[in-house]
Interface confidence: low
């Protein structure tokens, strides 16, 4: 057992059929003696009495909130949670495993530039009684800090029969170093509880590989004379890393025929133009991707030829 | 060239090379899917990499203060790369073809620190621990690492140059 | 889910050569990490040799030279052929996978199998 | 080559007692080296333990690994009818990566 924050704590069950469970002793918080008694939840039957109170947790059926009581008046609250170990693996039933990039991929994240702001995201079937908390830091050994915030509802969808929630947060390396090469990995921890089930779950990157820039801006096209070609242009998108001279991206062109099966055709280039040939019902889109690390492309921005 | 004294290097030429290195190393070590998750793995043996710290003057305003301290930084980390591609951790069993894009790695890792540094000024250089294991896996475990470092430390010696050659060449 | 699912059993002569498939289905095919362990019947385990990245192929000194592994990855299928058989290489020919380690987000293999193929029993008899 | 040398040969035992394996190395093995498997007739084998102590995806809690230098053992805490079938040490410190000889264990 292990105090979570204050009043609350986390009991680890080893769960299989007709496993002991955890031998519990609570402790009422109050200086008196005598005339204590001890209630579960909104029960009033009286589970002992005494200043501790002994209890085998074996189930969710134990968890719970356990309140020591005098003469009609609460003395001390014990909110016990339960994490479940199944064939020696935590439980993960609150969190959806995403797959990608493989399996056993609860949490993701990604970082818009080298600034040491991120974004980590996961999803849940779980629509109530659920609260996430996320902590972070900058190496295990001598974490170095990071500051996240709150975690928040960021998305609803509809997947077949099921409504799928995805929840996001925010967090941001304190004494951030865009220009130098990491050599420890940020590491990122989720608390997550529903009900009385606890899990958590974690996730190590460094930000080199998690960086996905957004799209380019400012796309345009202008038709060259005398010819079926033109200039594409756009600009570094505005939560890129400054300056560009420094912090550099290169970039795919491609032309897509209205079908999909049509041949695309792509150049790359480390410029902010290109000359590509338009074709009636086409499209032209723009992506960027760090010029010097293969991390991911950002997303496509487009134009039609027309 | 980085004469001793401290005047600027071929920015351009650096450059070229640094952004070209950046490319061999990736296709010396392809990205094979990109994992959020850590697992297993013993982490020792790269530990002792050099790496381009905050301190060291590689950031946009330390290069216009003074490039020297970045330089230097960026030097040692080149021969001490280049020292390990050359080791038998690469040269060993199993043996990679000798066009290898680890080999033309290994040349131009030279190609750039002699850029740097002409010959008869010596910058202090890192000591390069003793890594190679007698063992063929385990060098293979240590040629993923290796490369892995590689390409981070080269794409910000790439940024480097990059931004030297914009804003500092003469 | 990966599978390794690998070729049938054979009947061989001595001095003949034996080649043994073992194809991924289901997810994600790194030939790179396929090794082969081959047990005699009764016995134990022999590690045979691997297909490894960033460095070709590599044998147990005890088949160098008679055994030859190679992957063809846009069938997602490893291969390991034996040559000069004789009756004691007859044995159950399993392909396994290297289970992956990490490394700063990288993987790399560990050589410790966590996937294994059904087994190919090769017979060597005249 | 490493001689990996797994001790007893048999171990006959009944279901709920405690199994212990031993495996000898003939020079030393970083623990991060070692792994254990468990084969049953007929089937491949199945990765128990790796890095002498790390259970696998999906093993059982009552599997456990210990041990470094020369000197390995696998514990299995309270024996389930499913666990009888024949545990083999391996090293992958050196190659060529071998396999101890085996333990049984059976049914008493």
């Known amino acids: 057992i292990w105090e979570l924050k204050k009043d609350v704590y986390v009991v680890e069950l080893d769960w299989y059929p007709d496993a002991p469970g955890e031998m519990v002793v609570l402790t009422c918080d109050t200086p008196e003696e005598d005339g204590i008694t001890w209630t579960l939840d909104q029960s009033s039957e009286v589970l002992g009495s005494g200043k501790t109170l002994t209890i085998q947790v074996k189930e969710f059926g134990d968890a719970g909130q356990y309140t020591c009581h005098k003469g009609g008046e609460v003395l001390s609250h014990s909110l016990l949670l339960l994490h479940k170990k199944e064939d020696g693996i935590w439980s993960t039933d609150i969190l959806k495993d995403q797959k990608e990039p493989k399996n056993k991929t609860f949490l993701r994240c990604e970082a818009k530039n080298y600034s040491g702001r991120f974004t980590c995201w996961w999803l849940t079937t779980i629509s109530t009684d659920l609260t996430f908390s996320v902590k972070s830091s900058r190496g295990s050994s001598d974490p170095q800090g990071v500051t996240c915030g709150a975690a928040t509802l960021s998305a609803e969808r509809v997947r077949g029969d099921n409504k799928e929630y995805e929840y996001s947060v925010e967090c941001q390396e304190d004494s951030a170093c865009p220009a130098a090469e990491e050599s420890l990995p940020i590491e990122v921890m989720v608390d997550a509880v529903h009900k009385l089930k606890y899990e958590n779950y974690t996730s190590s990157f460094f930000i080199r590989d998690i960086i996905k820039p957004d799209p380019p801006k400012n796309l345009q096209l202008k038709p060259l004379k005398n010819s079926r070609q033109v200039e594409v242009s756009w600009e570094y998108p505005d939560t890129w890393s400054t300056p560009h001279s420094y912090f550099s991206l290169t970039f795919c062109v491609q032309v897509q025929g209205k079908s999909k099966r049509e041949k695309k055709d792509r150049v790359f280039t480390d410029k902010t133009s290109a000359t590509v040939i338009c074709r009636k019902n086409a499209s032209i889109s723009v992506r960027a991707q760090d010029r010097y690390y293969s991390s991911s492309w950002s997303e496509w921005a487009s134009v039609p030829c027309s | 060239r980085a004469v001793p004294g401290g005047s600027s290097p071929a920015w351009t030429q650096c450059q070229q090379l640094s952004q070209k290195l950046c490319t061999l190393a990736w296709s010396a070590h392809p990205l094979v899917g990109h994992m959020d998750l850590r697992e297993e793995g013993d982490e020792e043996t790269t530990n002792d990499v050099p790496h381009i710290q905050c301190g060291d003057g590689c950031d946009p305003q330390g290069l216009r203060d003074n490039s020297q301290f970045c330089l230097q930084r960026i030097h040692q980390g080149l021969i001490f790369y280049e020292k390990l591609l050359g080791s038998d951790i690469f040269t060993g069993e199993p043996s990679l073809l000798p066009d290898s894009p680890v080999a033309q790695l290994h040349a131009s890792l030279l190609g750039l620190s002699q850029l740097l540094q002409p010959e008869g000024h010596h910058w202090e250089t890192q000591q390069i621990p003793s890594l190679s294991p007698s063992q063929p896996w385990q060098r293979l475990l240590l040629r993923f690492k290796i490369l892995r470092s590689l390409q981070a430390f080269v794409a910000v010696a790439a940024r480097v140059f990059a931004h030297g050659a914009a804003t500092l060449s003469p | 889910q990966v599978e390794l699912v690998q070729s049938g059993a054979e009947v061989k002569k001595p001095g003949s050569s034996v080649k043994v498939s073992c194809k991924a289905s289901g997810g994600t095919f790194s030939s790179n990490y396929i090794s082969w362990v081959r047990q005699a019947p009764g016995q134990g385990l022999e590690w045979m040799g691997i297909?490894?990245?960033?460095?070709?192929?590599w044998y147990a000194q005890k088949f160098q030279g008679r055994v030859t592994i190679t992957a063809d990855e846009s069938t997602s299928t490893a291969y390991m052929e034996l040559s000069s058989l004789r009756s004691e290489d007859t044995a159950v020919y399993y392909c396994a996978r290297s289970k992956k380690g990490m490394y700063g987000g990288w993987t790399y293999p560990l050589m410790m199998f966590d996937l294994w193929g059904q087994g190919t029993l090769v017979t060597v008899s005249s | 080559d490493i001689v990996l040398t797994q001790s007893p040969a048999t171990l006959s035992l009944s279901p709920g007692e405690r199994a212990t394996l031993s495996c000898r190395a003939s020079?030393?093995?970083?623990?991060?080296?070692l792994a254990w498997y468990q084969q049953k007739p007929g089937q491949a084998p199945r990765l128990l333990i790796y890095y002498a102590s790390r259970r696998a995806t999906g093993v059982p809690a009552r599997f456990s690994g210990s041990g470094s230098g020369t000197d390995f053992t696998l514990t299995i805490s309270s024996l389930e009818p499913e666990d009888f079938a024949t545990y083999y040490c391996?090293?992958?410190?050196?190659?060529?990566?071998?396999f101890g000889q085996g333990t049984k264990v059976e049914i008493k």
């Open positions: 391996q090293q992958t410190s050196n190659t060529p990566f071998t």
């Open positions: 020079q030393s093995v970083s623990s991060n080296y």
């Open positions: 297909n490894a990245h960033l460095g070709g192929t």
